[in-house]
Structures are given as structure tokens and as C-alpha cells.
């Protein structure tokens, strides 16, 4: 059992390419940092894996369609939005996100768990920030992205709690 750090989340919702720059921000303390995650702030556009069957990102060939800076092939800072489960470990998911160029990994919990979060153990996948958020929050974000809304998340280090029991997948 180890201590766990919560994550402050500031989430914005924007309909891209409309010329409208009004965004809606939501500030909450609804995430927890992974046990092996850097305890650092990070920000980026949330990007789920490509394809409806790829939400768990357990296939090593999983890709992400990332927005680019206008007029370039340079990816904007982005965070992988991945669902827990699917037969692979948290470390697998986080390492895949890192390999694809993500600045962080946001893992959302299983369906049916509502707002429950757990401390993730992901030894070896320590290069990018990794947090877990609840299923309700993750599903809401995912559905927004699937409707064409661009969702940006700013993650900041919250408070220390503990000790909790670790989970690897």
C-alpha cells in the first residue's frame, strides 16, 4: 500500500473550426496520479484511440488521430484517453501512449464503476504523466469527442492521500 496523489483537472470543451472561441471550463479534483507517474502538471487535447473497438489500446498497433498545428504536420500537445481493461496492463497502455507521442495518458475506469478511481501501478511506464479518472467523466469526454467537440485537459498535482492498495490492470 502506498500514498496516492489526486489530480486537479481543468477541462475545456470547444467546437473546432467554427470561428467561435468560447470555451466552457470545468475545474474538479476527480483524478488520481498513477503510482509510477511523474508528479507533474501536463496539458493537451484529449485523443482516444482510432476505431470503436480500440478504446482499451491493448493492440500494439493502435493509432491515435492527433490534431496538428495549422499548416503543419507538427502534432499539438495531446493526452491519450484510454479505457481501463481489455486484457492488458496499465503499463502497456501508458507505454503505447508514450510511443505514439502523447504528453500524458488519461485512463478512465471500467463501465459500471461510476466515479470510482483506483491507484494504478505501472512499473516501467514512467516517461509521461498518467492519471485515472472515473468512468462517468471519461465516457462524457469520449462522447463529446465522438460528436466532434475538441476537449482539452489541464492536469495539476492535487493532494496526497493514502495509503491505498495498488492495481496493475
Amino acid at each position: 500500500a502506498e500514498a496516492v496523489w489526486t489530480a486537479y483537472l481543468n477541462v475545456s470543451w470547444r467546437v473546432p473550426h467554427t470561428g467561435v472561441n468560447r470555451t466552457v471550463w470545468e475545474l474538479s479534483e476527480e483524478g488520481v496520479y498513477g503510482q509510477d507517474s511523474p508528479l507533474e502538471p501536463v496539458a493537451g487535447v484529449l485523443v482516444p484511440p482510432d476505431g470503436p473497438g480500440a478504446l482499451n489500446a491493448c493492440n500494439p498497433h493502435t493509432n491515435f488521430t492527433v490534431p496538428t498545428v495549422w499548416g503543419s504536420t507538427v502534432q499539438v500537445s495531446w493526452l491519450a484517453l484510454i479505457q481501463r481493461g481489455g486484457g492488458c496492463t496499465f503499463a502497456d497502455k501508458i507505454h503505447l501512449a508514450y510511443e505514439r507521442g502523447a504528453s500524458g495518458a488519461v485512463i478512465f475506469n471500467f463501465p459500471g464503476t461510476r466515479n470510482e478511481v483506483i491507484p494504478m501501478s505501472h512499473p516501467g511506464a514512467v516517461d509521461i504523466v498518467a492519471i485515472m479518472i472515473g468512468n462517468l467523466k471519461g465516457t462524457k469526454i469520449l462522447q463529446s469527442i465522438q460528436r466532434g467537440i475538441q476537449v482539452t485537459m489541464v492536469i495539476e498535482v492535487g493532494k496526497k492521500h493514502g495509503p491505498w492498495v495498488n492495481h496493475y490492470s
Epitope: H17, G19, N21, T23, A43, P67, V69, W70, V76, S77
Partner: nanobody, 118 residues
Framework: QVQLQESGGGLVQAGGSLRLSCAAS????????MGWYRQAPGKEREFVAA???????YYADSVKGRFTISRDNAKNTVYLQMNSLKPEDTAVYYC????????????WGQGTQVTVSS
């Protein structure tokens, strides 16, 4: 409406340095991304560098390690420090402010000429 005014261009020898500035006025906030693009004679306008809210920076591969973008939110100004300049850096450099986010079409400045002689 956003107005952008670039300065700092000029003629420099290869290996030299220049610092471009771009002052923005009008409806601009610190949350908007700002960037630099360039257009060489007979070529399309191309991305050079950008800086988002939170000071995250982005660079074209051709300028990485040589150019540095920065911004002063209090002055609504973005800078491009260009070191180790090469003749192929010769172009008109345009300041950009993104309408809402870095992947959105930008507002453009009038441009400033940078000429690098060999």
C-alpha cells in the same frame, strides 16, 4: 479584430542571428496561441514555430535547435530568436495569432523580410 505588427527583420550573414517581434492589438487573450510562418520566393507559406497557452512550444524540424519562440502575455507580444541562420532561411516571416486553438486558421501580420546572405 486582431492587428499584428512584426519587426526585427533585415539582412544578416549566414551564421548570424536576428530577433523578430510581433505585437498584437485588439481582441487577443493570453489563452490564444501565437506563431510564426514564413514564405520564400516561389514557395508556399510554411510553419516555423508556435507557442500555445501554457507556454508549450512547437517547431518545424528545419528550425529545431536554432530558433526559439517565446511570448510576453503582458505585452501581447511574441518573439522569434533566430540563431545560426542559413541562406535557406531567407523568406518573409509572418506573425500569426490562432483564432481559437493551434489547429485553427490564424490571423496574419503583414510580414517582415529576412535575408540571409552566404
Amino acid at each position: 479584430q486582431v492587428q499584428l505588427q512584426e519587426s526585427g527583420g533585415g539582412l544578416v550573414q549566414a551564421g548570424g542571428s536576428l530577433r523578430l517581434s510581433c505585437a498584437a492589438s485588439g481582441s487577443i487573450s493570453g489563452g490564444k496561441g501565437m506563431g510564426w510562418y514564413r514564405q520564400a520566393p516561389g514557395k508556399e507559406r510554411e510553419f516555423v514555430a508556435a507557442i500555445g497557452s501554457g507556454a508549450i512550444t512547437y517547431y518545424a524540424d528545419s528550425v529545431k535547435g536554432r530558433f526559439t519562440i517565446s511570448r510576453d502575455n503582458a505585452k501581447n507580444t511574441v518573439y522569434l530568436q533566430m540563431n545560426s541562420l542559413k541562406p535557406e532561411d531567407t523568406a518573409v516571416y509572418y506573425c500569426a495569432v490562432y483564432t481559437t486553438a493551434l489547429d485553427e486558421y490564424p490571423y496574419w501580420g503583414q510580414g517582415t523580410q529576412v535575408t540571409v546572405s552566404s
